[in-house]
């Protein structure tokens, strides 16, 4: 048993038939001696009397809410959480697995630059009765602070019969070194407790290894004279590293036709502009990936041809 | 570039970009079997890192950027030397169309561009590395493709920048 | 084409000291280990140990430390092997072996202890 | 060290019959195990390498399988010319070492 927080507790427990549990020995928070009775969660059942309480928790069942009283007044109260392993493994039952970029993918996050500043998101199809609590740090042996907002809702989608909800939460490295070269990972760590079942997901990665940047914008095309060709440019992100001469972006230009098995033409380019043929009801894309760093592309940003 | 003259920044951007596409070419392609149940052996932490004290960004390149050429130049060193080691020359071969051959030979390249002959910096003392159980190899080339790769983009990072601003 | 060149047999006294050469031709030699086998006559293969041409780097069985001495001279492609304090144990068949996994070994050479 | 156990010592064969050689270490070596053949008085020719992979130019006949600690090597149809010793080896760890040799010949 460890205090999550105050008055907060979390059982360990091995979840098999007939497991015999973990006894727990709960102590009133007073200076009072006797008369101290012990109930469970709403129930009027007194549990057992004296300044300490000991239990068996073997289920759900004996989780909650146990609270001490004398002569009708609430003294304090001890919330027992239970965190499930079953064959060795905790459980993972109130996040969904992504299974991307791997399986048992619970958290992901994305970074739009090296300022040190990331999002993580998770998904799970619980509508109430949810709290999750987000730390993270560089590190985890001497850990250098990062400082994590409150987790938020962030979307919900209908996936066939189920609704699926996406929580998010915005971190931010406090002394950041967006020209380093990351030697010790982010941890980011999730508490998530669904009624009294408590659990914890992970993640740990390197800011470079999570970039995606924004779409490169004001995607422009200029016709160039007597020619079917044009000649499009478009600018670094807002949002990319400073400066550019020294985070830069590498760029693919797509001319991709109406019809989605029209072959796509493709160039590479270092540069800001390119000049490619523009198909009738084509459509002009162009996205980004730093330039020396093979992380993610950004999205596509899109123009028509017409 | 020892005592203080400019190292050659375009050839130096054009080497080191080509360096990072090797890095990335060569990551997959490190020999003929699967990782398996290879054990996380702990044996890449003592690689040079460029860190922020050693005036790589664009400040510290404009202040002087010896100190960060310096730094590139030991991490470049080791990394040669990782390179030809038997973590890479042992079983199991490189496949045959592996590229660590050339990354190899460019992080020479790049090295002594830096410090051409006759002139010398203080480089790091490159530990000895003792030979390497074979079943250890392929997770150890993982491990170091996938430190340099990071290595190197920041070292591109520099010389492009340098290239752009600090040429004559 | 790959291929490992031996030396040729040697006839050696009892307590002398011999030193046999592996000639690399075909790769560049410092990309591989070299592997040095003794073999008894009708006898199995025994492994001796290994050098990393590029950086001089050895490892032996510990059975043939003191016993054998692994060197390289990348200016030639030639890798080395010395046996010293010879005993009529010593007499056998030695290979050089480029890496386990690829079929390059060399023709072998001959030692024969005798008085 | 790694001890590599072969059986059998000797096995004598009918061109055309199908048959498995025996290698077991003594402690798990995952797929570091190769094959040579020897013919007197050659030196040992590569088989199979780790554990299953052919090697070019080696009939396909050949094949080997196995992990952990038992591996085998199957020659599907023995010719006259596959008369040889036969040697595992453990590619796992130092020392390296070989099998004593499975003896292949011909009724």
């Known amino acids: 048993i460890w205090e999550l927080k105050k008055d907060v507790y979390v059982v360990e427990l091995d979840w098999y038939p007939d497991a015999p549990g973990e006894m727990v020995v709960l102590t009133c928070d007073t200076p009072e001696e006797d008369g101290i009775t012990w109930t469970l969660d709403q129930s009027s059942e007194v549990l057992g009397s004296g300044k300490t309480l000991t239990i068996q928790v073997k289920e759900f069942g004996d989780a909650g809410q146990y609270t001490c009283h004398k002569g009708g007044e609430v003294l304090s109260h001890s919330l027992l959480l239970l965190h499930k392993k079953e064959d060795g493994i905790w459980s993972t039952d109130i996040l969904k697995d992504q299974k991307e970029p791997k399986n048992k993918t619970f958290l992901r996050c994305e970074a739009k630059n090296y300022s040190g500043r990331f999002t993580c998101w998770w998904l799970t199809t619980i509508s109430t009765d949810l709290t999750f609590s987000v730390k993270s740090s560089r590190g985890s042996s001497d850990p250098q602070g990062v400082t994590c907002g409150a987790a938020t809702l962030s979307a919900e989608r209908v996936r066939g019969d189920n609704k699926e909800y996406e929580y998010s939460v915005e971190c931010q490295e406090d002394s950041a070194c967006p020209a380093a070269e990351e030697s010790l990972p982010i941890e980011v760590m999730v508490d998530a407790v669904h009624k009294l079942k408590y659990e914890n997901y992970t993640s740990s990665f390197f800011i470079r290894d999570i970039i995606k940047p924004d779409p490169p914008k004001n995607l422009q095309l200029k016709p160039l004279k007597n020619s079917r060709q044009v000649e499009v440019s478009w600018e670094y992100p807002d949002t990319w590293s400073t400066p550019h001469s020294y985070f830069s972006l590498t760029f693919c230009v797509q001319v991709q036709g109406k019809s989605k098995r029209e072959k796509k033409d493709r160039v590479f380019t270092d540069k800001t502009s390119a000049t490619v043929i523009c198909r009738k009801n084509a459509s002009i894309s162009v996205r980004a990936q730093d330039r020396y760093y093979s992380s993610s592309w950004s999205e596509w940003a899109s123009v028509p041809c017409s | 570039v020892p005592g203080g003259s400019s190292p050659a920044w375009t050839q130096c951007q054009q080497l080191s970009q080509k360096l990072c596409t090797l890095a990335w070419s060569a990551h997959p392609l490190v020999g003929h079997m699967d990782l398996r149940e290879e054990g996380d052996e702990e044996t890449t932490n003592d690689v040079p890192h460029i860190q922020c004290g050693d005036g790589c960004d664009p400040q510290g390149l404009r202040d002087n950027s010896q100190f960060c050429l310096q730094r590139i130049h030991q991490g470049l060193i080791f990394y040669e030397k990782l390179l030809g080691s038997d973590i890479f020359t042992g079983e199991p071969s490189l496949l045959p169309d592996s590229p660590v051959g050339q990354l190899h030979a460019s992080l020479l390249g790049l090295s002594q561009l830096l410090q051409p002959e006759g002139h010398h910096w203080e480089t790091q003392q490159i530990p000895s590395l003792s030979p390497s159980q074979p079943w250890q190899r392929l997770l150890l080339r993982f491990k170091i493709l996938r430190s340099l790769q990071a290595f190197v983009a920041v070292a591109a990072r520099v010389f492009a920048h340098g290239a752009a601003t600090l040429s004559p | 084409e790959v291929q490992l060149q031996q030396s040729g047999p040697e006839l050696v006294k009892p307590g002398a000291s011999v030193k046999m050469s592996c000639k690399a031709s075909?790769?560049?030699?410092?990309?591989?280990?070299i592997h040095w086998v003794k073999q008894r006559p009708g006898q199995g293969l025994e492994w001796i140990g290994y050098i990393n041409p590029y950086d001089d780097v050895t490892k032996y069985n510990e059975k043939f430390k003191g016993k054998a001495t692994l060197t390289s001279d990348k200016s030639s492609s030639t890798a080395y092997m010395e046996l010293s304090s010879l005993t009529s144990e010593d007499s056998a068949v030695y290979y050089c072996a480029r890496r386990w996994d690829e079929s390059y070994w060399g023709q072998g050479t001959l030692v024969t202890v005798s008085a | 060290d790694i001890v590599m156990t072969q059986s059998p010592a000797t096995l004598s064969v009918t061109p055309g019959d199908r048959v498995s050689l025996s290698c077991r270490a003594s402690?798990?070596?995952?797929?570091?195990l190769h094959w040579y053949q020897q013919k007197s008085p050659e030196s040992p020719r590569l088989l199979i390498k780790?554990?299953?992979q052919s090697i070019s130019g080696i009939p396909s006949r050949f094949s080997g399988s196995g992990s952990g600690s038992d591996f085998t090597l199957s020659i599907n149809s023995v010719e006259p010319e596959d008369v040889g010793v036969y040697y595992c080896?453990?590619?796992?760890?130092?020392?390296?070492?070989f099998g004593s040799g499975t003896k292949l010949e011909i009724k």
């Open positions: 080896q453990n590619g796992h760890s130092f020392p390296f070492t």
């Open positions: 780790y554990a299953s």
């Open positions: 402690q798990s070596i995952s797929v570091y």
């Open positions: 075909g790769y560049t030699f410092t990309s591989s280990i």
